[in-house]
Amino acid sequence: IVGGTNSSWGEWPWQVSLQVKLTAQRHLCGGSLIGHQWVLTAAHCFDGLPLQDVWRIYSGILNLSDITKDTPFSQIKEIIIHQNYKVSEGNHDIALIKLQAPLNYTEFQKPICLPSKGDTSTIYTNCWVTGWGFSKEKGEIQNILQKVNIPLVTNEECQKRYQDYKITQRMVCAGYKEGGKDACKGDSGGPLVCKHNGMWRLVGITSWGEGCARREQPGVYTKVAEYMDWILEKTQSSDGKAQMQSPA
């Protein structure tokens, strides 16, 4: 996160860290807890690393440096990448992770509400992006979970800023015209959440941007409301019945 500040314990209890253990262990992506056994993240996090066994999912944590070999983590039972996601394109950047064992909810580890299907009418004015990603383009992973308040940008405006890309209705953009605040490398898959009527909802999944926090280059997020049918289908068909935080 560029231009952000430290988060507090329990402030974003749905935020998880997706880490890979090969020879060393490192944080690669963020994710959002959406049910006892489900995490929503970005499909591109798994490019080149589709093997379930190498992943460790840490929930209920604030500081990555607190993680030791004894820190509990979740393992992956199943990775469900959107069927239309292609490595050669930037569309449908969404994936579900089914955890091997369900998580208990606590003050520091609980799910985020999902939006209603095709939610286009709600005007979100209080939106935040969180993650342990770089604090500048050529930076490094941060220890303490960062947060930043960023306004949503219309898709029309976003398309003007990204003429070489197709900004679809299944994407949502956020950023300041002058730049300075944005998600960055390592924040991928994490949440863009907005507070509406006193409740936090998962509006976007951190997907991509041209650099980080550049002027007139907003961050681009996968629009969760556009994938509600897919999320419900996959979580229900896998579970028999959904163990989801009900859509708002």
Partner: antibody, heavy 125, light 108 residues
Framework: EVQLLESGGGLVQPGGSLRLSCAAS????????MTWVRQAPGKGLEWVSY????????IYADSVKGRFTISRDNSKNTLYLQMNSLRAEDTAVYYC??????????????????WGQGTLVTVSS | DIQMTQSPGTLSLSPGERATLSCRTS???????LAWYQQTPGQAPRLLIY???SRATGIPDRFSGTGYGTDFTLTISRLEPEDYGTYYC?????????FGQGTRVEIK
Amino acid sequence: EVQLLESGGGLVQPGGSLRLSCAASGFTFSHYLMTWVRQAPGKGLEWVSYISPSGGHTIYADSVKGRFTISRDNSKNTLYLQMNSLRAEDTAVYYCARVARGIAARSRTSYFDTWGQGTLVTVSS
Amino acid sequence: DIQMTQSPGTLSLSPGERATLSCRTSQFVNSNYLAWYQQTPGQAPRLLIYGASSRATGIPDRFSGTGYGTDFTLTISRLEPEDYGTYYCQQSSRTPWTFGQGTRVEIK
């Protein structure tokens, strides 16, 4: 199967014009940025131009700026290169290529993942 | 413009040997925008490596790419007969997009 097929090459006199076409199949053409690359006989590869998925944004190499025009017809899945005021140094095999633009570590990637077989343009009197 | 300088110009090696090809850029290039292509005589170029280190679909694991910033390397761990040809690095970080002049890998 993803395929690109160029046509329209041939022999043309200096100062003349030629229009190259590139027919795309096997993928959603309107989702992809497309590019032209050329290769003079016995030489290396030279990027010529690219066009955005909608066709609204184009960029050219200095060597062809003002003389060449890239365009596309998404309804026909076809890419074009209109070449005017041709010079001897434009003699080359012209390739069209699809520009893949995935995502890695929250940044876009960019690379030419599919190439046509090429069409030879010879500029000579 | 970003200049791409490949070395050596020609590499003469026997099958089974290791080939190391270098590509230097005149300015910082985001790794996501650095690719390597192989071209054999009379054929169109073929994508080998994208994002500086990711192998394209169908490319054998004897091909690997590394590097960051201004120094990039393509390595062929054990040369096979079909690997002989010319290799190009290319950047699309900034326009104009540019290619290196190529490294020719020939049979010793």
